[in-house]
Interface confidence: medium
């Protein structure tokens, strides 16, 4: 029995619902009473959802999963996962058994956009060209870990004196804190760009020192 799932990972935003697509080709005369369907976590084999003996056996995964019962007879064994969390990320396997048996795994990639970075400048007054300043860039509650880039007003990357750290909170979302130490020119704009590598989303802010 051929079971089909998408090759590319399903990308889902934290807090939204995701559909993990899985399909099979039912033979003529197929009845749901013949169908055994199991969704499980690929690595741990933990049961997520099942359908057997013509009945939806329900969610075994925090009551956040559902099948599409009206579509099962047409070979649609997709799983709906509600209120996606970082901890849901990983591979899910769809097992379909009628008379024959088949399975395939689909990957779920979880993402969350980073907040617009906030920037602070220290010292923030009585600045002159030649002074060394510390510019702090903080962005919150994104996933996965961010890529942080600094650049000047002409778009030239600033890679020298940069310190970046990231830490996950208990929801698995990352906060990023990046510091640029720079010697001031006559006047200057400094930009911090926080990139989510999965969403290809850039959150950026600038500070201009005159």
């Amino acid at each position: 029995l051929e079971v089909q799932v998408p090759e590319d990972p399903v990308v889902a935003l934290v807090g939204t619902d995701a559909t993990l697509c899985c399909s099979f080709s039912p033979e003529p005369g197929f009845s749901l009473a013949q169908l055994n369907l199991i969704w499980q976590l690929t690595d741990t084999k933990q049961l997520v959802h099942s359908f057997a003996e013509g009945q939806d056996q329900g969610s075994a995964y925090a009551n956040r999963t559902a099948l599409f019962p009206d579509l099962l007879a047409q070979g649609n064994a997709s799983l709906r996962l509600q209120r996606v969390r970082v901890a849901d990320e990983g591979s899910f396997t769809c097992f379909v058994s009628i008379r024959d048996f088949g399975s395939a795994a689909v990957s779920l990639q979880v993402a969350a956009p980073y907040s617009k970075p906030s920037m602070t400048l220290e010292p923030n007054k009585d600045l002159r060209p030649g002074d060394t300043v510390t510019i702090t860039c903080s962005s919150y509650q994104g996933y996965p870990e961010a890529e942080v880039f600094w650049q000047d007003g002409q778009g030239v990357p600033l890679t020298g004196n940069v310190t970046t750290s990231q830490m996950a909170n208990e929801q698995g979302l990352f906060d990023v804190h990046s510091i640029l130490r720079v010697v001031l020119g006559a006047n200057g704009t400094y930009s911090c760009l926080v990139r989510n590598p999965v969403l290809q989303q850039d959150a950026h802010s600038s500070v201009t020192i005159t």
Partner: antibody, heavy 116, light 107 residues
């Protein structure tokens, strides 16, 4: 200049609740988490949790879940911590602090005394 | 939870001396340790974070070193205003935790 101005000392009875405030100035309120830290004499510092004023998400130390409730009012740039079902163990100085996962700016502390 | 053990708990020194305060974590925290200064009548002050990054405005006589489980705060050429309480704090994972503190007093 960044300042976190906390409310004054509180004397409360066992079993009661108290709400202390932390007013931020000198920076954009949504730029940092507001953390709360407990200090009992001779017992060092204990992290209670944070609130992110940008979206009022919270993150608590397991030890303080059910004890502390963190809220924030963006319009007044003020964060609040409510402590409930107070006992003598809750007598302490409570600090608010601004930062990501370390604390760049601190309030002056609020002394809470629980006594009959 | 990560336990931070600070030593010594008390330290007596004189202006001009160099002192070190140690902080040991119960498991690896990479480089993610901060140091604070506490003085009566003043708000707590962040000195160092990420093990060795000096907070803006903090004098260069303060320095931090270490990684994984063992960290050190060094104050070289002590000034009178440096006599205070010092705390370490890990920012590698939640819950955030602190050391019990080191009291630096005038000899």
């Amino acid at each position: 200049e960044v300042q976190l101005q906390q409310s004054g000392p509180e004397l409360v009875k066992p079993g009661a609740s108290v709400r202390i405030s932390c007013k931020a100035s000198g920076y954009t309120f949504t730029s940092y988490y507001i953390h709360w830290v407990k200090q009992r004499p001779g017992q060092g510092l204990e992290w209670i949790g944070w609130i992110y004023p940008g979206n009022v998400n919270t993150n608590y130390n397991e030890r303080f879940k059910g004890k502390a409730t963190l809220t924030a009012d963006k319009s007044s740039s003020t964060a609040y911590m409510q402590l409930s079902s107070l006992t003598s163990e809750d007598s302490a100085v409570y600090f608010c602090a601004g930062g990501t996962y370390f604390f760049a700016y601190w309030g002056q502390g609020t002394l809470v005394t629980v006594s009959a | 939870d990560i336990v931070l053990t600070q030593s010594p708990s008390h330290l007596a020194a004189s202006p001009g001396e160099t002192i070190t305060i140690n902080c040991r974590a119960s498991k690896s925290i990479s480089k993610y340790l901060a140091w604070y200064q506490e003085k009566p009548g003043k708000t707590n002050k962040l000195l160092i974070y990420s093990g060795s990054t000096l907070q803006s405005g903090v004098p260069s006589r303060f320095s931090g070193s270490g990684s994984n489980t063992d960290f050190t705060l060094t104050i070289s050429s002590l000034e009178p205003e440096d006599f205070a309480m010092y705390y370490c704090q890990q920012h590698n994972e939640y819950p955030l935790t602190f050391g019990a503190g080191t009291e630096l007093e005038l000899k």
